[in-house]
């Protein structure tokens, strides 16, 4: 409970205070008063910074003082040895003594009394906007003539709102204009004209002087015009900064003048008048207006007639003209009706390509189809540009209404293969170096993607499993990685008719025509890790010469493992067929002479021990296209070999291009048009 005065004595006063004491007193006087605290006796053990024993005076979070030692009064007429004056109504006194006292100390005696504070002068922040009146225990604010005190009981303002102007012409000014306008006020004026007229406000630059904006550009005092959902302003500064003629497009206008506590200027004066609401001379395409006028206003009527080849497609179908009236809101009636050109509609989407959402689908507009580069290109030409024709179709100059076709780009790896030395004697590779590489997991083998629906592989890979599971897009063949890659499902396996099927494939000595095609159930989506390899051309340019280099890749046996976990690759040269014949077969299943060598086979390898091996079968022997050095084609397929790390035999793909093309054409899915 607050009190007006009180006494505070140290423990046992006037006897010696005990050791190890901590005591605090919370002084509180009524609100609106300050506290005068004074000590009449002080005898506390002296120490540096009063570290041992002390009496501490705290106001809020501030330490007003910390006392120790002996004090006596400087004034023989006053017993006060130390005093404190605070302008707040709460104070805390804390007395502390440590564990020992060298002598006997008697402590302190202190008294407090409530003192009046002058809220009008004692604080940095002045509490009233205008006049401040102090009284004992408080204060009140008051205002000059014609001002009133706001609900906060601190700020004064003038009452300048409520005026409604309905006349078609008038003048409005800020309070006291041209004398300084009142501070801390909000003046609202309303102009309300009959419908069909818009308020037009005119100002002269010199009739406007309002406190300027702050450094951030925010108006301290401001004039704002609000017409429906449109706002003009806020405006401030010396000279009107806005347009001197404001067409509000509305019959109702609110004028709001807001001022702050400081910086009064002369204010502003404006004129307004009502104009018949104009309706814009709309540029309605493909039509003629009658009568033709420079300006149309409220209640004007026009006939809008469509040009030849256009019609009003909303409302009465087939109409060639309609009437429109300038309405009170400044809008034309029947404004939804238009002479519209033919609409070709949203263009059809295409597989593996896109068409930008057209700005317009109307007659004469142009769209462009593009393929998803760099993985697809436009096969059937025409440049992809189509225009909306008069018959309502999108038409291309070359293809007519036929849509473009995006087909995979072949033979271009996203990242070129760089040999890093470590397939047998080869290097680690990334699937982006060989995006055509297909993994078969039973038997463990390879293949080459040649388009969206077809995989090329060796016949001996698929002869024992006509429903192989294949994967693309993964460098690693760990189960965890394959689970996240693309699995290909076969629809049918086509083995070359020249491949001899055996009862016991393990004893095979004839690998002639070791080639097969796998037709996929679903098309493969191409990307950086999945894209096809090209097929060889039929010209003599694609005849391989001894020494020509090719790339092989796969997850077959390496020097370190029976199966590679990550893709391996090697660059090896084409060699004469006799080099392959001369190598002794490592684990012969028959007499060495029984092994068949034919012109359908390519011999390659023999350099630095680089070779394909068990598990690489069916993968491509990729050679740079002689007519386009950016591309690779499948010159061969890993087929068989006498001994890993020497020379290997590859199916010569060029000899089978006709069979490949024929098989694919005869078994392609007809396009759904």
């Amino acid at each position: 409970e607050p009190t007006m005065y009180g006494e505070i004595l140290s423990p046992n006063y006037p006897q010696a205070y005990p050791s190890e004491v901590e005591k605090s007193w919370d002084i509180e006087v009524p609100e609106g008063y300050g506290i005068h605290l004074y000590f009449t006796h002080l005898d506390i053990e002296l120490s540096e910074n009063c570290a041992y024993d002390s009496v501490q005076i705290i106001s809020g979070d501030t330490e007003e003082g910390r006392l120790c030692g002996q004090r006596s009064s400087n004034n023989p007429h006053s017993p006060i040895v130390e005093e404190f004056q605070v302008p707040y109504n709460k104070l805390q006194v804390i007395f502390k003594s440590d564990f020992s006292n060298e002598e006997r100390f008697t402590g302190f005696a202190a008294y407090y009394v409530a003192t009046d504070i002058n809220e009008c002068t004692d604080f940095v922040d002045v509490p009233c906007s205008h006049f401040c009146n102090n009284f004992i225990g408080g204060y009140f604010c008051s205002c000059p003539p014609e001002y009133f005190l706001h609900d906060d009981m601190k700020n004064c303002g003038v009452n300048c709102s409520g005026d409604v102007f309905t006349a078609l012409i008038g003048e409005i000014a800020s309070p006291n204009y041209p004398k300084p306008y009142p501070e801390n006020s909000r003046c609202e004026y309303q102009i309300r004209l009959e419908k069909g007229f818009q308020v037009v406000v005119t100002l002269r630059r010199e009739d406007f002087d309002v406190e300027a904006a702050d450094s951030a550009g925010n108006c301290l005092d401001s004039l704002v015009f609000v017409a429906g959902d449109r706002q003009f302003g806020p405006y401030c500064g010396h000279g009107f900064p806005g347009p001197l003629n404001i067409e509000t497009k509305s019959n109702a206008l609110d004028i709001i003048f807001q001022t702050d506590l400081t910086g009064q200027k002369k204010g502003w004066k404006l004129r307004y008048h009502g104009d018949p609401m104009p309706c814009p001379k709309e540029d309605t395409p493909n039509s003629v207006w009658e009568p033709a006028k420079a300006k149309y206003v409220f209640r004007d009527v026009v006939q809008i007639t469509c040009l030849d080849g256009f019609e009003v497609v909303e409302g009465r179908v087939g109409a060639t003209s309609f009437y429109s009236t300038c309405q009170s809101n400044g809008k034309w009636s029947n404004s939804k009706l238009k002479c519209q050109p033919v609409d070709c509609g949203i263009p059809e989407s295409i597989e593996n390509g896109k068409v930008e959402d057209p700005e317009s689908t109307l007659f004469g507009s142009v769209i462009r189809y593009t393929c998803e580069e760099p993985y697809y290109y436009m096969e059937n030409g025409g440049g992809g540009e189509y225009h909306c024709a008069g018959n309502g179709s999108w038409v291309n100059e070359v293809l007519g209404p036929e849509l473009p076709k995006c087909v995979p780009v072949c033979g271009v790896p996203r990242e070129p293969f760089e040999e890093k030395q470590r397939i047998i004697g080869g290097s680690d590779a990334d699937i982006k170096n060989f995006p055509w590489q297909v993994f078969f997991d039973n038997p463990w083998a390879g293949g080459a993607l040649i388009n969206e629906y077809w995989v090329l592989t060796a016949a001996h890979v698929v002869e024992g499993n006509r429903e192989p599971t294949m994967y693309v897009g993964s460098t690693s063949v760990q189960t965890s990685r394959l689970a996240k890659s693309k699995m290909l499902t076969p629809e049918h396996v086509f083995i070359h008719p020249g491949w001899k099927l055996l009862e016991v494939p393990e004893g095979r000595t004839n690998f002639d025509n070791d080639i097969a095609l796998v037709r996929l159930k679903d098309p493969v989506k191409m990307g950086p890790t999945v894209s096809p390899i090209c097929l060889p051309g039929t010209s003599s340019d694609y005849n391989l010469m001894d020494g020509d280099l090719g790339l092989i890749s796969g997850w077959g046996r390496t020097e370190k493992r029976d199966r590679a976990v990550r893709l391996k690759a090697a660059r090896l040269p084409v060699a004469p067929l006799r080099k392959c014949k001369e190598v002794k077969v490592e684990k012969p299943t028959a007499d060495a002479e029984a092994y068949v060598f034919t012109p359908n086979m390519i011999c390659a390898g023999g350099e630095k021990g680089m070779d394909s091996c068990k598990g690489d079968s069916g993968g491509a022997f990729a050679v740079q296209d002689p007519n386009d050095k950016t591309k690779f084609y499948a010159a061969g397929l890993v087929s068989w070999g006498p001994q890993c790390g020497t020379y290997g035999l590859y199916t010569r793909v060029k000899n089978y291009v006709d069979w490949i093309m024929k098989t694919m054409q005869e078994n392609s899915t007809p396009r759904e048009d």
């Epitope: 039973n442 760990q478 965890s480």
Partner: antibody, heavy 125, light 107 residues
Framework: QVQLVESGGGVVRPGGSLRLSCAAS????????MSWVRQAPGKGLEWVSG????????GYADSVKGRFTISRDNAKNSLYLQMNSLRAEDTALYYC??????????????????WGKGTTVTVSS | DIQMTQSPSSLSASVGDRVTITCRAS??????LGWYQQKPGKAPKRLIY???NLQSGVPSRFSGSGSGTEFTLTISSLQPEDFATYYC?????????FGGGTKVEIK
């Protein structure tokens, strides 16, 4: 370098529980299956349990089925073995080991190519 | 469960000797077999996987052979560091099972 470190072993009374952990480093943990193998004092090796790369498939030796649970937290590169209803015959040195699984539909297993140093479990009253 | 019978359970040999250890499966396990070496106080180490494939970093004196039910680990010329216990492991089906072990000691 590739490393497996087991922890969590200790002395426990029959019927009690223990949870072993195996912290993996130096390889992509979630590409590999993992196994627990134990070796009783002076005895041979016994496979206890295994789990595949994503934790969806587990296996147990008959001697621990229903009492032990194998699990993994790929985010923490950690393998666990929760052992409940422990018996005296579960006293052993417990190793964790790495398993490799290749192939997408047909699997090719390469078990226990890397081993930890082991953690000792003693079940005694 | 598939039982793996390893023989002999122990053998004494000299440095330079050719040593053969056999593992017999109670049923056919194709070539799903590995061989492990364990030295006292150490964790086992894989020597051979898939019956005949040498683990990278393992000396070529170690070799594995066999398929189906009969498997062999051969050390062509025993070295001082080869004295240890050897285990076979079948992983054809769960539960995986180890052989009882063969301890190779110095004669």
């Amino acid at each position: 370098q590739v490393q497996l470190v087991e922890s969590g072993g200790g002395v426990v009374r029959p019927g009690g529980s223990l949870r072993l952990s195996c912290a993996a480093s130096g390889f992509t943990f979630d590409d590999y299956g993992m196994s627990w193998v134990r070796q009783a004092p002076g005895k041979g090796l016994e496979w206890v349990s295994g789990i595949n790369w994503e934790g969806g498939s587990t296996g147990y030796a008959d001697s621990v089925k229903g009492r032990f649970t194998i699990s993994r937290d790929n985010a923490k590169n950690s393998l666990y073995l929760q052992m409940n209803s422990l018996r005296a015959e579960d006293t052993a040195l417990y190793y964790c080991a790495r398993d490799e699984q290749l192939g997408g539909q047909t699997y090719y297993y390469y078990y226990m190519d890397v081993w930890g140093k082991g953690t000792t479990v003693t079940v005694s009253s | 469960d598939i039982q793996m019978t390893q023989s002999p359970s122990s053998l004494s040999a000299s440095v330079g000797d050719r040593v053969t250890i056999t593992c017999r499966a109670s049923q056919g396990i194709r070539n799903d077999l590995g061989w492990y070496q364990q030295k006292p106080g150490k964790a086992p180490k894989r020597l051979i996987y898939t019956a005949s494939n040498l683990q990278s970093g393992v000396p070529s004196r170690f070799s594995g052979s066999g398929s189906g039910t009969e498997f062999t680990l051969t050390i062509s010329s025993l070295q001082p560091e080869d004295f240890a216990t050897y285990y076979c492991l079948q992983y054809n089906q769960v539960p995986l099972t180890f052989g009882g072990g063969t301890k190779v000691e110095i004669k």
